[in-house]
């Protein structure tokens, strides 16, 4: 049974031209995290994996760069960077759990970090 | 181009122990981050993931065989094993051993890229 | 754990022509699909990862398609030496599955 509950950094805002970092938290379980992968939409960013260490996508090896943790560091961002991003947790034995992030990457001085909330 | 070579009894008595070695040449096992798998095919049947160890020492099994099997590796001999116990007849098969993720940091895969030729074990009396 | 299905068991088909192979996962595995081609007495060779990319000297006859739970394998103009038994396979979850495979034949 999955019991575990996956805590995001939920809706986030940043500078253009600035950098992000993504991150995704699982709690409530023993399993252990065998792989993460990190997607916008339908595209791969990057994965890390526990044994085989970090994949970055050809397409994003400029702009994005592995951690902290398990987490991601967006660099250079564009306004076309607004969009959902997803924390896609492999573990053994439970299986897969998904996060969701939303990034709005705005033009003004203004941006600030949404509140944290979580994903059964 | 890493390559493996299954070895170990080719019959096995019910209720014994099964106990397969592969050797890795071409690399060291030591220095690369692979999976390292142990895969079985039934004769005329289709093929069953037994389980694998990651380089961190992790190991992962299959649920149906997880209380019989020990998989594990031995650096400096450049070989990793796996133990089956309380082997029945249903446990007749090709083993093989392979390498999964061995391209997995430049293109993002895991799936099993390079296997061992396979050894039959026959489980009789 | 998540279960491969393999259509059509056994596949009869004249060279030359072209063979299309479905395999099905019970749950969605993204784009995490790969194919194995199986000839007597051998062991599986990887054909296609990531459920489209050809694996290295792989001729491109040999095409896959599909993501999330429907997945495709398509050879274009069968020659004698594609006779064989092919699988699917999911990964990274653990555990590992196969499907059963599918039997291409000389029709």
């Known amino acids: 049974m999955m019991t575990g509950t996956i805590e995001t950094t939920g809706n986030i805002s940043a500078e253009k031209g600035g950098s992000i970092i993504l991150q995704c938290h699982l709690s409530s379980t023993t399993a252990q995290v065998t792989q993460v992968n990190w997607e916008q939409q339908d595209q791969l960013l990057a994965i890390c994996n526990a044994d085989l260490g970090w994949h970055i996508s050809p397409s994003f090896k400029d702009r994005v760069a592995p951690g902290p943790g398990l987490g991601l560091t967006l660099q250079s961002l564009t306004v076309n960077d607004t969009g959902e991003y997803f924390c896609i947790y492999h573990t053994y034995p439970d299986g897969t759990y998904t996060g969701r992030i939303f990034l709005e990457v705005l033009e003004s001085s203004v941006a600030e970090h949404g509140a944290r909330f979580q994903i059964p | 181009q890493l390559q493996l070579q299954e070895s170990g009894p080719g019959l096995v008595k019910p209720s014994e122990t099964l106990s397969l070695t592969c050797t890795v040449s071409?690399?060291?096992?030591?220095?690369?981050?692979?999976?390292w798998a142990w895969i079985r095919q039934p004769p005329g049947k289709g093929l069953e993931w037994i389980g694998s160890?990651?380089?961190?020492?992790?190991?992962y099994y299959n649920p149906s065989l997880k209380s019989r099997v020990t998989i594990s590796v031995d650096t400096s001999k450049n070989q990793f094993s796996l133990k089956l116990s309380s082997v029945t007849a249903t446990d007749t098969a090709v083993y093989y051993c392979?390498?999964?993720?061995?391209?997995?940091?430049?293109?993002?895969?895991?799936?099993?890229?390079?296997w061992g030729q396979g050894t039959m074990v026959t489980v009789s009396s | 754990e998540i279960v491969m299905t393999q259509s059509p068991a056994t596949l009869s088909v004249s060279p030359g022509e072209r063979a299309t192979l479905s395999c099905r996962a019970s749950?969605?595995?993204?784009?995490?699909l790969a194919w194995y081609q199986q000839k007597p007495g051998q062991a599986p060779r990887l054909l296609i990862y990531?459920?489209?990319t050809r694996a290295t000297g792989i001729p491109a006859r040999f095409s896959g398609s599909g993501s999330g739970t429907e997945f495709t394998l398509t050879i274009s103009s069968l020659q004698s030496e594609d006779f064989a038994v092919y699988y699917c396979?999911?990964?990274?979850?653990?555990?590992?599955?196969f499907g059963g495979g599918t039997k291409v034949e000389i029709k």
């Open positions: 071409g690399g060291s096992i030591s220095s690369s981050r692979y999976y």
């Open positions: 990531g459920a489209s």
């Open positions: 392979a390498i999964e993720g061995a391209n997995f940091r430049d293109f993002g895969y895991v799936a099993f890229d390079i």
């Open positions: 749950q969605s595995v993204s784009s995490n």
């Open positions: 160890i990651g380089t961190s020492g992790s190991t």
């Open positions: 396979q999911q990964s990274p979850p653990w555990p590992r599955t």
